[in-house]
Amino acid sequence: LSTCKTIDMELVKRKRIEAIRGQILSKLRLASPPSQGEVPPGPLPEAVLALYNSTRDRVAGESADPEPEPEADYYAKEVTRVLMVDRNNAIYDKTKDITHSIYMFFNTSDIREAVPEPPLLSRAELRLQRFKSTVEQHVELYQKYSNNSWRYLGNRLLTPTDTPEWLSFDVTGVVRQWLNQGDGIQGFRFSAHCSCDSKDNVLHVEINGISPKRRGDLGTIHDMNRPFLLLMATPLERAQHLHSSRHRR
Amino acid sequence: LSTCKTIDMELVKRKRIEAIRGQILSKLRLASPPSQGEVPPGPLPEAVLALYNSTRDRVAGESADPEPEPEADYYAKEVTRVLMVDRNNAIYDKTKDITHSIYMFFNTSDIREAVPEPPLLSRAELRLQRFKSTVEQHVELYQKYSNNSWRYLGNRLLTPTDTPEWLSFDVTGVVRQWLNQGDGIQGFRFSAHCSCDSKDNVLHVEINGISPKRRGDLGTIHDMNRPFLLLMATPLERAQHLHSSRHRR
Amino acid sequence: ALDTNYCFSSTEKNCCVRQLYIDFRKDLGWKWIHEPKGYHANFCLGPCPYIWSLDTQYSKVLALYNQHNPGASASPCCVPQALEPLPIVYYVGRKPKVEQLSNMIVRSCKCS
Amino acid sequence: ALDTNYCFSSTEKNCCVRQLYIDFRKDLGWKWIHEPKGYHANFCLGPCPYIWSLDTQYSKVLALYNQHNPGASASPCCVPQALEPLPIVYYVGRKPKVEQLSNMIVRSCKCS
């Protein structure tokens, strides 16, 4: 490339690489790379790889526009996942015969273990794997609000698909709300969209780990694919560091 | 400001001002400022000011994140508005006694007059003015699809308000679709959100220019505030210019 | 758009996204990031000429604003437009961590 | 953020948004734009130091990345981050036109 003076492409690349070295450590709030002396031998644990792949898949589907980056968003976010309370739990009993909806409950103490304080949460996604399907359906997501009431969160038009497909809903606000309350069981309802004059109010979508027809409860494989919350949060120690050094340059 | 060499702030400002001179003309695809010899004397017409104010209000509520700007988006967009077909039109007759919804019909020939070709449309917003209200309601917007079917477009949770408030829905895709079809009457339905087990399916929101209780059809004032489409489009002559010069730098 | 599709397949001299793959072990001497082994970081490079609007060929000058100085800057600069995050896996002591780093991959550039 | 709230009320020497009001008649000699009479265009200015990671005071250096070179550029540059459009009214012959110009007002800046 030539401008007024010739650009040394190799120097630019070297400077970019050096800057990335600092950028990664800076985003992780590490003064130096972590030592590998204590790393257990062998491949990465299955669950860690699954979590990494979930995150990578999310990135691939993410819009690539640069978002203005507040200080807290510059830093890396730890990714964890919290599985839905097992279907055998008694909490599901009263939802058995409802045809327009399926229900997913979560233990907020599991969420709090991953995200000790509400402001640390940067994003929470509810992930559901739908089985392949030949029908189109308009579906809605609700949050359990009080004893028997549900608050509308969002909707999706699900088109037919030949392969199982992961659905993702942004539930950051809801999870932050849960973290502000005491521990307990909280939940979501995934429903058919019932319009004011519609007659067919049956949910035709089948969700892995919930839909009774093909539970396939074969331990781990089923476990990996049952609905879960994907959480992105600032680790507590990084947040404390952030808080204590909140001064301007 | 001082870096290695002192920055001449006045020079920077002058260069920025000169660049803006070029930028505005460039965005309007004008080689020079338009002559003012033919401009009618007196203030701007009422309707033009109303349209300008609508656009300015929209900007104020708009997120200020930079959106990646494809070539077509760099250029200025002409703003026009198309009012809803008057409520006295026979097309509204069959919608009179429906309590869960209100209906808004538009003449696509009016839209085509403003936007002669579908690709020229850059954004279309449906604007409704709701009266002040003490109730919270979850509402939905539908597009007329075929004879008696409606396609879901979006929803909004409307909270109580002490003052009349403008609601805005992005209907760009719908209007582009209409432009691709022949002329005729097309419409939207604004409904209460009816959940699968909800009993109260009445729309409590009152919309200026529609809600029968307080029509106040007093010519212009009412006319200004009845539902309309706010259209942003590349003017035809600018688009032709664009098309002919689509080469890379 | 000055994106990977256009820039990687052209010999654009002006502002464009340039290819750069970073191998953590080879380029940074790091073996602590377990996944991925590297990533396409890319970078923006190339001039964004400041356009003097007093140029005699004014209509030609105006056509250049779109690419060279769309933001009407006093000194336009070639910078990232679209960015993507990068998830990584690393260990802290014996504990594996999955973290997401925002704005790590340059997908397109712009004069700003 | 390096936005109007922070930058207009500080004497920041590094990258920041700077105040600039453009009066169409006075600054550009134009009377053809009927509305608005002018607008707060603003602009970005100030250094974004490139940070060498071989600096001995490394932990201090890392803390500066966030502001000075968050995108890990080889030569970071002070550019607009948040922009807003500007609607204008002007005449073409006898016909008034309302048009919206995208990305005209600089609300905040960043090192990129």
């Epitope: 590490l30 003064a31 030592s35 | - | 073996k31 | 071989l54 001995t56």
Partner: antibody
Framework: EVQLVQSGAEVKKPGASVKVSCKAS????????MHWVRQAPGQGLEWMGR????????KYAQKFQGRATLTVDTSTSTAYMELSRLRSDDTAVYYC???????????WGQGTLVTVSS | DIQMTQSPSSLSASVGDRVTITCRAS??????LNWYQQKPGKAVKLLIY???RLHSGVPSRFSGSGSGTDYTLTISSLQPEDFATYFC?????????FGQGTKLEIK
Amino acid sequence: EVQLVQSGAEVKKPGASVKVSCKASGYTFTSYWMHWVRQAPGQGLEWMGRIDPQSGGIKYAQKFQGRATLTVDTSTSTAYMELSRLRSDDTAVYYCARWDYGGYFDVWGQGTLVTVSS
Amino acid sequence: DIQMTQSPSSLSASVGDRVTITCRASQDITNYLNWYQQKPGKAVKLLIYYTSRLHSGVPSRFSGSGSGTDYTLTISSLQPEDFATYFCQQGDTLPWTFGQGTKLEIK
């Protein structure tokens, strides 16, 4: 201020055991692993082992496996190192040191001299 | 275990001198090399970690460099308080191992 304060000097007979304490202050005790390092008179430093106060996970250098026992009391932010079956060549200054995940010891105790003599 | 060989084992120098101590590892330790200062009756102090990073509060006359198996600690201009024993330590692979020390004395 981050500090590690160790117990006082000990004199022990061969075959006996010694338990050295290390009280941490100025930081969250469970957030950092505690390591133990010793230094025989006129010699270099020798790593003995470490404990994770949060999980209780322990790792010993092979040489001290079976003879050293590391424990913590999180309620008092104190780490302990017990060495049994003492021999005269165990005479040394014993240090506790806070480990940073970067692979270095950023804070050290002042040391505890243990003398093994009959 | 990785062997750490430090040299010299002792050295005499004067205030204002530039001093260099080296440390060689028996295998590549990928920059996980740290330097400590020890004074009689005082707690050991971390000076430099990860080859060249200065620990907070350490004067900038101390610097580190190196890669692979060979590393260096440099004191650019000796001060009276710098006379002490210096140790290197590798943080790459368990068990953590130290050099045998370099005693820096006043000439």
